[in-house]
């Protein structure tokens, strides 16, 4: 059998296979050693017994989308049946005091590979043996502690495969400089050691995307905005726009990035090299926000001018892709990490990203201020309590609700929260009365709210001791 017979039915065209060569990866036309690595079809009954105590699930994730030329990283994590975990030696053990369907296990091991390898290796002195090989026959790399790596992962995409020895979690990075744009499929098959052979335990696939557009996200924040995720904001208060570029491999780290904003309110264009910008809308309504991000990124060089007379075909200048993984000190393949371009060739290409949002601007409460605090007369029966009136003004729209949060002087430990509806006139002047139990210093957070906004003000107040001898205290401000 060949690798493509085993690993998947996705068959890229001859063009794709030729133009998407991943360095360190091999053609899936290679032969697969079915004696060492048996192949089971989906639904084969043997899958049921491929793992003690249940099925292993493999979870494949990637940091897709990837800007063409950047590295994309794939991570596979194995999820074992309940109560099982991998220990420091790479053996699979039962968790202490964990009860599964079979109850508590007397044997601490699910798989004790350390013992197996000591018993059954039959190696020559080099630590190499005929069964410590990948499905294509290549020997396992002998990193320090390689014997504790008991899972074999075979990654397959674009008509090529990449083999990796690992523990219950592995990562593989691929450079996308030459990958065809658009969605691609990555498939991973996982085997475990089984004496002198291997047993399949999981298969998983995931779509990843390579794009020539910079992946751009914008977060928006505005003080007093009640719900930051609904793209509704308040008139006359600055909105902070923060651009997040999805660039997990730091491909654009050395690029100058320009941000060009149009806020849709006929205030022109704003061009900046800063990823944050503030803008205040002075009109309510719906506006179309547009952002264009431009970065000069490493890219393919234009073909050299044709020579006067072509003598014989020259090899393609196209950059080939390298893979390297994070469990090993160096690249996975034999080649070092640099792009295989002609020496000193260093070309750049402008890449663009776009973001568009429709944002709604509404009236809201812009500001709230406590302009006066008055100690209220209290009748005799409550000598320990103080009533205080807070006179509050606001700007912007008229609030429908007032909340007070009374807490300790550090404003961290809440003692009491009271919310109540309010009916306020156009002047936005209201009195909020609150009770304080006992003397001392209190932090008072007072918020006024309506459907779309929530404005806050804070103050520290000192409540004096009550004198039980005096039945009433005169109000003072």
């Amino acid at each position: 059998k060949r690798f493509h017979d085993v690993l998947g039915n996705e068959r890229p065209s001859a063009y794709m296979r030729e133009h998407n060569q991943l360095n360190g990866w091999s053609s899936d036309e290679n032969d697969w050693n079915e004696k060492l690595y048996p192949v089971w079809k989906r639904g084969d009954m043997r899958w049921k017994n491929s793992w003690k105590g249940g099925r292993v699930q493999a979870v494949l994730t990637s940091d897709s989308p990837a800007l063409v030329g950047s590295n994309i990283t794939f991570a596979v994590n194995l999820i074992f049946p309940r109560c099982q975990k991998e220990d420091a030696n790479g053996n699979i053990v039962y968790e202490k005091n964990c009860r599964n369907e079979a109850g508590l296990s007397a044997d601490p091991y699910v798989y004790n590979w350390t013992a197996w390898s000591e018993d059954s290796d039959g190696e020559n002195g080099t630590g190499q043996s005929h069964h410590n090989v990948f499905p294509d026959g290549k020997p396992f790399p002998h990193h320090p502690g390689w014997r504790r790596w008991n899972f074999i992962y075979v990654f397959h995409t674009l008509g090529q495969y990449f083999q990796k020895l690992g523990r219950c979690s592995v990562r593989v990075s691929v450079n996308t400089a030459n990958v065809t744009l658009g969605p691609q499929l990555m498939e991973v098959t996982v085997y475990r050691r089984h004496g002198r052979a291997y047993v399949p335990i999981a298969q998983v696939k995931d779509v990843y995307v390579v794009t020539d557009q910079i992946p751009v996200f914008v977060t928006m924040f505005q003080k007093n905005d009640r719900n930051s995720s609904d793209e509704t904001f308040l008139k006359d208060l600055p909105i902070m726009f923060d651009v997040l570029i999805h660039d997990p491999s730091h491909f654009l780290n050395y690029s100058t990035i320009n941000y060009k904003w149009s806020f849709g309110d006929n205030t022109g264009l704003f061009v900046s090299t800063n990823h944050t910008v503030n803008h205040t809308y002075v009109l309510n309504g719906t506006f179309s926000l547009n952002l264009t991000v431009k970065a000069a990124a490493p890219g393919p060089c234009p073909p050299p001018p044709p020579p006067p007379r072509p003598s014989k075909p020259t090899p393609s200048l196209a950059t080939t892709l390298k893979s390297y993984d994070s469990n090993t000190p160096g690249p996975a393949g034999d080649n070092p990490l640099e792009l295989s371009r002609i020496p000193d060739e260093n070309c750049q290409i402008n890449r663009y990203g776009h973001f568009q949002a429709t944002i709604t601007i509404v009236e809201g409460i812009l500001e709230v201020n406590i302009i006066q605090m008055t100690d209220v007369l209290m009748p005799v029966p409550w000598p320990e309590s103080s009533l205080i009136d807070f006179v509050v003004t606001c700007q912007g729209s008229i609030p429908t609700e007032v909340c007070t949060i009374i807490s300790d002087p550090t404003c961290e430990i809440t003692q009491n929260t009271v919310c109540s509806p309010v009916d306020v006139d156009e002047m936005c002047l209201l009195t909020v009365r609150r009770t304080f139990n006992g003397s001392g210093t209190y932090c008072v957070n007072l918020t006024l709210g309506d459907d779309t906004s929530l404005a806050l003000t804070s103050t520290l107040i000192s409540v004096p001791d009550r004198d039980p001898a005096s039945p009433l205290r005169m109000a003072n401000s």
């Epitope: 149009s262 205030t267 704003f270 309510n284 601007i361």
Partner: antibody
Framework: QVQLQQSGAELVRPGTSVKVSCKAS????????IEWVKQRPGQGLEWIGV????????NYIEKFKGKATLTADKSSSTAYMQLSSLTSDDSAVYFC????????????WGQGTLVTVSA | EIQMTQSPSSMSASLGDRITITCQAT??????LNWYQQKPGKPPSFLIY???ELAEGVPSRFSGSGSGSDFSLTISNLESEDFADYYC?????????FGGGTKLEIK
């Protein structure tokens, strides 16, 4: 094509009000801001305020708050500016204007309406 | 509020001359500035947008330059129809503000 057609000249008494109209055609009225500009005889241009016809949202320069009121009627694609408590200082040509299809200030202008305040 | 200082307030020139009008903003307005030409009894007409871009149908003898806070309008090879009033407008933020205007007269 985009057109802004303003109402005709007005001769009004001090202390009264006047309402100037600006009828838009050739585009989606709700999608573009309408701005108003004042020009006194022999003087420069002065921005008054702006209305978002889609929402009715307005913004005025401080000196025209209370003097000018901007409204819009989507059904007739017409923007209005009402000027109140008129004095001789309000005698001027008033223009409505609108931006291009991208954020670029005023590209299209009405022909102007002359308001004369005189006893 | 952004103030726009336009100079000169008036100037005279001859046919075929090259003239420059400047506008200075009290803060950075990027390139969010337009130039308008106005003839008596007419509304302003759109000449230049984004400080340097020629509006549709405007002859190439008109050009704009500048960014940030300093801007200029240049007319090379003056023709008779170019004698008019010229205004700059900042539309970077509200309130919009115009320059005081430049009256270009024939010598």
């Amino acid at each position: 094509q985009v057109q802004l057609q303003q109402s005709g000249a007005e001769l009004v008494r001090p202390g009264t009000s006047v309402k100037v109209s600006c009828k838009a055609s050739g585009y989606a009225f709700s999608n573009h801001l309408i701005e108003w500009v004042k020009q006194r005889p022999g003087q420069g241009l002065e921005w008054i305020g702006v209305i978002n016809p889609g929402s009715g949202g307005t913004n005025y320069i401080e000196k025209f708050k209370g003097k000018a009121t901007l409204t819009a009627d989507k059904s007739s694609s017409t923007a209005y500016m009402q000027l109140s408590s008129l004095t001789s200082d309000d005698s001027a040509v008033y223009f409505c204007a609108r931006g291009a299809n991208w954020d670029v200030g005023f590209a299209y202008w009405g022909q102007g309406t002359l308001v004369t305040v005189s006893a | 509020e952004i103030q726009m200082t336009q100079s000169p307030s008036s100037m005279s020139a001859s046919l075929g001359d090259r003239i420059t009008i400047t506008c200075q903003a009290t803060q950075d307005i990027v390139k969010n500035l337009n130039w308008y030409q106005q003839k008596p009894g007419k509304p302003p007409s759109f000449l230049i947008y984004y400080a340097t871009e020629l509006a549709e149908g405007v002859p190439s003898r008109f050009s704009g330059s500048g960014s940030g806070s300093d801007f200029s309008l240049t007319i090379s090879n003056l023709e008779s129809e170019d004698f008019a009033d010229y205004y700059c407008l900042q539309f970077h933020e509200f309130p919009r503000t115009f320059g005081g205007g430049t009256k270009l007269e024939i010598k």
